[in-house]
Interface confidence: low
């Protein structure tokens, strides 16, 4: 037979008694605690700092505060200084700054994250220009420039004309990683360093000698030729040098083709057909053009008085 333990129980302050096997349980009204509801519940007055959990000690009714991270003390009202707990919570030599209930890290250049645990990739922002290669380093970046560029960000196009490389008043054109010289007439080469040999193309004809000069050349003609390039054969038949004949032009010479009865370089000499004494038997010879005439003595006749 079950004995009603509540009959002899002493639940305080109007608490409700519940009988159990060989025991009882006092159900306390609001604000009371303890086995017999005989103690005031200390948590009623909210003694624990906001954000803490309050539990009542069932023996003495006092409040037990369970503190959230960053707080300590009986009422969880004291801030924990995380920066003074030994090891620096901020990595990579970040500076620890205590805050209420927590801490902050001031990171060195090149690091980020709540605890400075992340190495910033300085190349993410593409700081290197003109197709340069970006090398991420701790707290910095380095640009490896393409040829023809310089500067921290490879932003400067190297002025290859700065050293005035073009000679002989050549005009320098700055290009990417190179320069180009526009040479004045008569000069050539990457730097306009060469005087153009105008004789290289053998402009002088007919065996003439070529004399190279600055931006010009002179042809010294061989005998019988004339013109800038000695390309003109001089006409030695003009004016006609042949007196009694026709002229044939040659190289630096001429030939007279004499009419019959004439001879000499210029056909200037009339051939004396009487010089061979063609008239016989005392006939008299008279010279004619390419002919002769015999005047015969009485008693002789024939072209040469031979009869």
């Amino acid at each position: 037979e079950n004995i009603d333990d509540c009959a002899s129980a002493a639940c305080f302050h109007g608490a409700t008694c519940h009988d159990r096997v060989a025991s009882f349980y006092c159900e306390c009204p609001h604000g009371r605690t303890g086995l017999l509801c005989h103690l005031n519940d200390a948590c009623i007055s909210n003694p624990c700092n906001e954000g803490s959990n309050c539990d009542t000690n069932p023996v003495n009714g006092k409040a037990i505060c369970t503190c959230p991270s960053g707080y300590t003390g009986p009422a969880c009202s004291q801030d924990v200084d995380e920066c003074s707990l030994g090891a620096n919570p901020c990595e990579h030599a970040g500076k620890c700054i205590n805050t209420l209930g927590s801490f902050e890290c001031q990171c060195l250049q090149g690091y980020t994250g709540p605890r400075c645990e992340i190495d910033v990739n300085e190349c993410v922002s593409n700081p290197c220009q003109n197709d340069a290669t970006c090398l991420d380093q701790i707290g910095e970046f380095q640009c490896i420039c393409m040829p023809g560029y310089e500067g921290v960000h490879c932003e400067v196009n190297t002025d290859e004309c700065a050293s005035s490389p073009c000679l002989h008043n050549g005009r320098c054109l700055d290009k990417i990683n190179e320069f180009q010289c526009e040479c004045p007439t008569g000069f050539t080469g990457h730097l306009c360093q060469y005087d153009v040999d105008e004789c290289a193309s053998t402009p002088c004809k007919n065996g003439a000698k070529c004399l190279d000069g600055p931006n010009t050349y002179t042809c010294v003609c061989t005998e019988g030729y004339t013109g800038t390039h000695c390309e003109v054969d001089i006409d030695e038949c003009d004016p006609d040098p042949c007196h009694y004949g026709s002229c044939k032009d040659g190289v630096a010479t001429f030939t007279c083709l004499c009419r019959p009865g004439y001879t000499g370089h210029h056909c200037e000499t009339n051939i004396n057909e009487c010089s061979s004494q063609p008239c016989r038997h005392g006939g008299t010879c008279q010279d004619r053009d390419n002919a002769y005439l015999c005047f015969c003595l009485k008693g002789t006749t024939g072209p040469n008085c031979e009869i």
Partner: antibody, heavy 115, light 109 residues
């Protein structure tokens, strides 16, 4: 005008230490890597060490590795070379130089290692 | 960090032209446009004469010119003058260091 001025040279015994400084002016110091170059009496030029603009990367010749330390203080526009365990063969004029296509050199400071 | 190869000495008469060669590898001269030439008179700091293979700093005579072909760089001095007598050093770069030539002594006869 771009200028580099070395200081800190002098006479030191073998095994001793010396710290060279190089004060820079006339350009944005942190934008440029810097080098130390030395020249022994009657000999040629020898590269010693280099450091990147912010000091993250350092490079050393085999002959000084483990004994010399290059560093820089960009707030003071100054380059340093800490030389430890000095030997007679470290005797030289030490020049600091700016790393760029058109390099700039200082006038040098003489380091003599002798007992 | 091997040194670049230069002739130990060259000489020429006033008015003549001379060329100093500087031979490296594909890791230095052959791999970079970064070639400089320095002139050094006794007791003086090196003076930059040519940078970026063929560029002259302002104030350097146009008698000095530089060029590069493959792994070899060259410095040419035309119209030699007495004051050109000095030591000349070539300089290039590899991936992490500077590389110098052993130096060439120029004598003006």
């Amino acid at each position: 005008e771009v200028q580099l001025l070395e200081s800190g040279g002098g006479l030191v015994q073998p095994g001793g230490s010396l710290r060279l400084s190089c004060a820079a002016s006339g350009f944005t110091f942190s934008n440029y890597g810097m080098s130390w170059v030395r020249q022994a009496p009657g000999k040629g030029l020898e590269w010693v060490s280099s450091i990147s603009g912010y000091g993250s990367n350092t490079y050393y010749a085999d002959s000084v590795k483990g004994r010399f330390t290059i560093s820089r203080d960009n707030s003071k526009n100054t380059l340093y070379l800490q030389m430890n365990s000095l030997r007679a063969e470290d005797t030289a004029v030490y020049y600091c130089a700016r790393i760029s296509q058109q390099a700039v050199w200082g006038q040098g400071t003489l380091v003599t290692v002798s007992s | 960090q091997s040194a670049l190869t230069q002739p130990a000495s060259v000489s020429g008469s006033p008015g003549q032209s001379i060329t100093i060669s500087c031979t490296g590898t594909s890791s230095d001269i052959g791999g970079y446009q970064y070639v400089s030439w320095y002139q050094q008179h006794p007791g003086k700091a090196p003076k930059l004469m040519i940078y970026y293979v063929s560029n002259r700093p302002s104030g350097v005579s146009n008698r000095f010119s530089g060029s590069k072909s493959g792994n070899t760089a060259s410095l040419t001095i035309s119209g030699l003058q007495a004051e050109d007598e000095a030591d000349y050093y070539c300089q290039s770069a590899d991936s992490s260091s500077w590389v110098f030539g052993g130096g060439t002594k120029l004598t003006v006869l």
